[in-house]
């Protein structure tokens, strides 16, 4: 008679994760008499998945049964199947023994793959702002999908982009990957309304990729323009000047007015327009009592944007031309910032 | 004692076996394991396999070596050989031992692999 | 692919001295423990000093010494002898049912 063999007609087999897994075995004789026992690894290291003798092995069900006497399909099912249940599998009879049963004969071993979903891409900008034409790096990672091939875009406003780097790990056979990708975006002045999107596609997401999104409005800022216009005298001796400060983004801002280079009032803006790009516009006006200066004088509008150095403009009242008022000596009224856009 | 047989000089292409022979052991459990280095190199794991004939390999050597088990020996096979599979080849068992070492190792076999 | 760094590549010390070699794996060996070191000198098979990461094998002297578990290991060779001339290897056992070297460390005695 024959010697009996192992049959695992799988060389292997895909599963998803949270799914149940088949495993099939068949033995070609019923001798010698001995057990079956799965294992997953050939080698030292090879975990016990089911003993057919003894033990609990609640995940692990037969498919036929195998206390019947001429039984000789030792296929198994895994439920509830995780990445972690990736390896080659083999089906192992063993001879009767005393007083310990004798490894006698292996299956050539099934290979379970699992296929699990990428996690939802996380995506991350700088950690300090920038402003426009300079370049960001925007971060993106997900996890824990496999098999291994994957593919990721990166998108600006739906348009594609080319620059960006991804590193899939690890680089040999594991269980699960994670992937890992850095785009570079250059900002432009229109950016605050901008989203940057990450999209992954994986053979388990049935054509409907992942996205993960970062709002630009988070990483951008626009610096002001500054522009400082003298209007119409309103009273005898009185110039009314205003600091019209443009396109800037986020809103944090605080000015400073300075009269012949001291401080005259400050304020932090507080009402300000919203333009159509996202940007803000807002303007400070100063009244200013030509009658309380004899030469001419140095009005300067200084603005501090979120945090970054001070930018100014400054505008030159000549006041010879207007009549001097005796007894006064109060250079400017501190007005708040005018709500009304003056132009 | 292990020992191994068959390293000769061979033509790129020329598929090679080489064989394992285990003697003086009650085997009852075992795994032996294929290793190799290639001359002035490091050691080399190419797969191992148990007593009931189950092989496992190395990624990078799946395809290109078969591991198998006769009733006297264990063989390796280099499916098509290249000169980079120039080096010697040990069989290492791992006998009475459950944390994955390799206790007992044959001398070697040279294999050469040119034109 | 696991991969299991060694170091340094090379080492010398004198007669008496002592020696440590270094053993990074990229995952966690098999049960944190799976780690071998074996001793190879020229024309020889490498033999077996150390497995289980620390249990001393069977005639090796107490010069030697491992450590270490789940991915840093460390051999320590005490006493240093002359015969103790030689590279050495660290192995890993992992889930995955492979079982690698790392890229060895020679040890020239002074």
């Known amino acids: 008679e024959e010697e009996l063999q192992v049959i695992q007609p799988d060389k292997s087999v895909l599963v998803a994760a949270g799914e149940t897994a088949t495993l099939r075995c068949t033995a070609t004789s019923l001798i010698p008499v001995g057990p079956i026992q799965w294992f997953r690894g050939a080698g030292p290291g090879r975990e016990l998945i089911y003993n057919q003798k003894e033990g609990h092995f609640p995940r692990v069900t037969t498919v036929s049964d195998l206390t019947k006497r001429n039984n000789m399909d030792f296929s198994i099912r895994i439920g509830n199947i995780t990445p972690a249940d990736a390896g080659t599998y083999y089906c192992v009879k063993f001879r009767k023994g005393s007083p310990d049963d004798v490894e006698f004969k292996s299956g050539a071993g099934t290979e379970l793959s699992v296929r699990a979903k990428p996690s939802a891409p996380v995506v991350s900008g700088p950690a300090a702002r920038a402003t426009p034409q300079h370049t960001v790096s925007f971060t993106c990672e997900s996890h824990g999908f496999s098999p291994r091939d994957i593919t990721l875009k990166w998108f600006k406003n739906g348009n594609e982009l080319s620059d960006f780097q991804t590193n899939v790990d690890p680089v040999g056979e594991s269980v699960s990957y994670s992937i890992h990708s850095t785009a570079k975006v250059v900002l432009t002045r229109e950016d605050v309304h901008s989203q940057v999107i990450c999209e992954v596609a994986h053979v388990t997401l049935q054509g409907d990729p992942l996205r993960g999104t970062a709002n630009l409005s988070e990483t951008i800022r626009v610096p002001p323009t500054l522009e400082v216009t003298q209007q119409p005298v309103r009273a005898e001796n009185q110039v009314n000047v205003t600091c019209q400060v443009r396109k800037f983004y986020p809103q944090r801002l605080q000015l400073t007015w300075l009269e012949n280079g001291n401080v005259s009032r400050t304020e932090t803006a507080s009402t300000v327009t919203e333009n159509k790009d996202g940007t803000y516009n807002w303007m400070s006006w100063l009244l200013v009592n030509v009658s309380a200066h004899r030469d001419d004088v140095k009005l300067t509008c200084q603005v501090e944007h979120d945090g970054q150095p001070a930018v100014s403009k400054s505008h030159d009242l000549k006041v010879s031309a207007h009549p001097k008022e005796q007894g006064s000596n109060t250079a400017a009224e501190n007005t708040g910032s005018n709500e009304r856009n003056i132009y | 004692s292990v020992e191994e047989s068959g390293g000769r000089l061979v033509t790129p292409g020329t598929p090679l076996t080489l064989a394992c022979t285990v003697s003086?052991?009650?085997?009852?459990?075992?795994?032996i394991s294929w290793v190799r280095q290639a001359p002035e190199k490091g050691l080399e794991y190419i797969g191992i396999i148990n007593i009931g004939g189950g092989a496992s390999y190395a990624s990078w050597a799946k395809g290109r070596f078969t591991i198998s088990k006769t009733s006297t020996t264990v063989d390796l096979k280099i499916t098509s050989p290249t000169p980079e599979d120039t080096a010697t080849y040990f069989c290492?068992?791992?006998?009475?031992?459950?944390?994955?070492?390799?206790?007992?190792w044959g001398p070697g076999t040279l294999v050469t692999v040119s034109l | 692919a696991q991969v299991l760094t060694q170091t340094p590549a090379s080492v010398s010390a004198a007669v008496g001295g002592t020696v440590t070699i270094s053993c990074q794996s990229s995952?966690?060996?098999?049960?944190?423990?799976?780690l071998s070191w074996y001793q190879q000198k020229p024309g020889k098979p490498p033999k077996l000093l150390i497995y289980?990461?620390?249990t001393l094998a069977s005639g090796v002297p107490s010069r030697f010494k491992g450590s270490g578990s789940g991915t840093q290991f460390t051999l320590t060779i005490s006493d240093l002898e002359s015969d103790d001339a030689a590279t050495y290897f660290c192995q890993g056992g992992y889930r995955t049912d492979i079982y690698p070297f790392g890229g060895g460390t020679e040890v020239v005695v002074k």
């Open positions: 289980g990461a620390s």
């Open positions: 003086g052991f009650s085997l009852i459990s075992y795994y």
């Open positions: 995952e966690s060996v098999y049960k944190n423990n799976f």
């Open positions: 290492a068992m791992s006998y009475g031992m459950d944390t994955g070492a390799f206790n007992i």
